[in-house]
Structure formats: C-alpha cells, structure tokens
C-alpha cells in the first residue's frame, strides 16, 4: 500500500485570500483505502472525500490556521500525516516617516508595515539599509504593535512599527536609505522594501 499527501510538507504557509488544496490519498493492495481528515475545526476548510482520497480545501482565512491530520487505513494498518497550516498576511503596505531625510539633523525615522499577520516579532523583522547593508550606527527604538481598524468582523490584522535614531549620514550624504521588512515563515521568506530619500 502507499500513503501520499500533496503537497507533502508538514508545514504550509498560505497567503490570506488565496486558496490551497491538500490531497491525501492511499491505495491498498486489497480493497479500498479509508481516508479522512481529523482534528478539523468546523471553520477549517472544507473536505471532499472520495474512495481512497480526501481533499482538504483551505480558503485562506485567518481562521484556517490549525493542524489537521490525514488518516489513511487499509484493514488494520493505518498511516497518518499532520499538516500545520499557517495563514499569513503581508501586503506591500509599508509607510515610512519622514518622507525624506535631512542630513546633519539628529532624527528618528519610522517604518510601519500595515495589515500584518502573524503579529509576531519572531516572524517579522525590520532593517534600515544603506545600499544592501544595514545602516551602521542606527539605534533601534522599541517596536510598536497596534491592531488595525477592521471594516468587517474577523481575526484582527496588525500594524507593526519600527523606529530608529539615525547616525550622521556623512558627507556627501547617500541618495536614500531603505526600510526593509522581512516575514519569515516555514519554508518561505517574504520581503518588502520602501525608499526614504535623503535631501541633497
């Protein structure tokens, strides 16, 4: 007999608003395999069960986060495979302040990523870049996390802000700095970047 799950990963990241199908199938040497998903919240996707297979459709809602388990059996032999589903939100919605930097001033620059999920400092990281390198000497102030105002009911999204105190930008000043925000998920790294021009 063979037991297969497609995609085969034990952790799957799904962008909010996108759908994903996880197909669990099993074939038996004799007879028809029994395959089903368990550990499902009522809200976690929909299941279509066919002879020898079961398809879990995840709708890409934040409530779809969970760890369903596919169980397949041939007679007295059974196999199982769990899939940790993480639904994330990371739109390219970075806002920087100020809109431009003035050389020779002691200033604070902020970078806000809007409509984020999960709002976990371990998943989301901010960097202030000069070219492709972190800006040497910038001092990171404490990050802020606030709930976004939602038009509809549902699991809330967050905005996360990082501020830095800038070192002297030198002479001549660089044309721009960049705020880079990275979301690190299982087997997936996403990055957005926003320019902060420097007045010349």
């Amino acid at each position: 007999q063979s037991f297969q799950v497609n995609p085969p990963e034990s952790e799957v990241a799904v962008a909010m608003g996108t759908s994903l199908q996880i197909t669990c199938s099993m074939s038996c040497d004799e007879g028809v395999a029994r395959v089903h998903w368990r550990g499902l919240d009522t809200s976690l996707g929909s299941v279509q069960t066919l002879p020898g297979s079961s398809i879990l459709s995840v709708r890409g809602m934040l409530s779809d986060t969970g760890t369903p388990v596919c169980v397949g059996s041939c007679g007295s032999r059974s196999f199982q495979h769990s899939v940790k589903i993480l639904v994330y939100a990371f739109p390219d919605q970075l806002v920087v302040s100020p809109e431009f930097l003035v050389p020779g001033q002691d200033q604070v620059v902020s970078c806000t990523a809007h409509n984020i999920w999960p709002a976990d400092p371990n998943s989301l990281s901010f960097a202030l870049l000069l070219g492709e390198q972190r800006l040497e000497g910038a001092q990171a102030l404490e990050p802020e996390q606030e709930e976004e105002i939602q038009e509809a009911e549902g699991t809330p999204l967050f905005r996360m802000t990082q501020r830095w105190r800038l070192p002297s930008l030198g002479t001549p000043a660089p044309p721009a700095l960049h705020c880079q925000v990275t979301m690190q998920l299982p087997k997936l790294v996403l990055t957005h970047r926003k320019e902060i021009p420097v007045l010349q």
Epitope: D106, V108, R134, E136, G137, Q139, A140, L141, E142, R163, R165, L166, P167, S168
Partner: antibody, heavy 119, light 107 residues
Framework: EVQLLESGGGLVQPGGSLRLSCAAS????????MHWVRQAPGKGLEWISY????????NYADSVKGRFTISRDNSKNTLYLQMNSLRAEDTAVYYC????????????WGKGTTVTVSS | DIQMTQSPSSLSASVGDRVTITCRAS??????LAWYQQKPGKAPKLLIY???SLQSGVPSRFSGSGSGTDFTLTISSLQPEDFATYYC?????????FGQGTKVEIK
C-alpha cells in the same frame, strides 16, 4: 562645565510616590535625549527610561512601565521622573544621564540620588 | 532584549598587570558598545564608546576591541586608581542593557 545634578530622593513607604529632578547645566539641554538609570544596593546598572529632546519620544523598562513617568522642562533645563506605586524593589540610587546625538552612548552622568522604599 | 554577559565577575590583580575583561552579547550589537568604570559611591564614568573609541580625557592604557557579539576591555598596565567595577553596555537597540559588572580588586 557639563553637569547633571539629581535631587528628590528619600525614604518613602511602599505604594507611595516621589518625584526626582535632574538639573542640567553647561550644554544646550533641549538638543539631547536624556535617561534615568538606577542601581539597587550591591547590584548592577539598570536602564529605566528615556525621553527625546522635544519630549516626542519616551520609553520605559518593563519593570517600571505604568508606574513611572519621565518628563522634561527645557525652559528650566530640568529632567524629571515621577515615581508612583513604589515597591521595595525600586530601592536604588537613581542616575540621570545624557546621551550623545548620532552615537547614543551615555557620555555624562549625574552623581545620583538615593530612593529607599520601606515601611 | 539583548543580554550582556561579562567575565569574569571579579578578578584580583596587581599594579602594573595587564587586565582583560570580556563582554558577550546574546545577539549582534555591531559596534554599539560602551564600557564604564564605577567606583564605590560614585557615578559611572564613560571609558570607551563604539567598541574601541577612547572617550576624551581617559588614559590611553584603556582600550576596547570587538564587534558583533564579543568585546574586550583591556587595561595595559593597571594603576592604583583603576581598582573599580567595570560595566559594558549595548546601545544598539532598546531596552539598552548592561553587563552584570566586573570588579577589579587589589591582589
């Protein structure tokens, strides 16, 4: 000469309040971010709060958040720390310190003022 | 928060000795590290900033080195006035944090 001088320490009962002051002289006070750092008897240094030159940014260590408030009066060249709901573990010498623009280390410290919280 | 760990926590040395104190950060602080000296009943005094820059007025027998997570304060020839407690501090990100201190005592 650049100087910082703290005052306002003393003995206070648990749950009580105290306001510390730090008088600055010898530099343009409003140009500098300022800090409070404390040191419990026989212990190391613990940063507790900062305030930016224009008071637009403040922050606190978790150990004092919600109980202490930092403020400044640039016209008087004075930094303040309002301490409420004091606990025995707040007993310490409290120092104010200036931080260096563009570099951010604490380059000038006051002599400290002692706060004792005891019944 | 970034943890700063100093070693040793105390040491005994004689006048003229070369003394080395190390400081390790739990994550990279680049070169955003300062060293302070504190004598009993006194305020801390800045010795070194940006990991290796000597503060104005501090004797040249004090030097700092390192970057990232590992830093060293060296006193090339210990003088009687150097017996004190030394603290490292990272100011890369808030909350700024100090090492637990290294007490340098007379042997």
């Amino acid at each position: 000469e650049v100087q910082l001088l703290e005052s306002g320490g003393g003995l206070v009962q648990p749950g009580g309040s105290l306001r510390l002051s730090c008088a600055a002289s010898g530099f343009t006070f409003s140009d500098f971010w300022m800090h409070w750092v404390r040191q419990a008897p026989g212990k190391g240094l613990e940063w507790i709060s900062y305030i930016s030159g224009d008071s637009g940014y403040t922050n606190y260590a978790d150990s004092v958040k919600g109980r202490f408030t930092i403020s400044r009066d640039n016209s008087k060249n004075t930094l303040y720390l309002q301490m409420n709901s004091l606990r025995a573990e707040d007993t310490a010498v409290y120092y104010c310190a200036r931080d260096r623009p563009y570099y951010y280390y604490m380059d000038v410290w006051g002599k400290g003022t002692t706060v004792t919280v005891s019944s | 928060d970034i943890q700063m760990t100093q070693s040793p926590s105390s040491l005994s040395a004689s006048v003229g000795d070369r003394v080395t104190i190390t400081c390790r950060a739990s994550q990279s602080v680049s070169r955003s590290l300062a060293w302070y000296q504190q004598k009993p009943g006194k305020a801390p005094k800045l010795l070194i900033y940006a990991a290796s820059s000597l503060q104005s007025g501090v004797p040249s027998r004090f030097s700092g080195s390192g970057s990232g997570t590992d830093f060293t304060l060296t006193i090339s020839s210990l003088q009687p006035e150097d017996f004190a407690t030394y603290y490292c501090q990272q100011y890369k990100s808030y909350p700024v944090t100090f090492g637990q201190g290294t007490k340098v005592e007379i042997k």
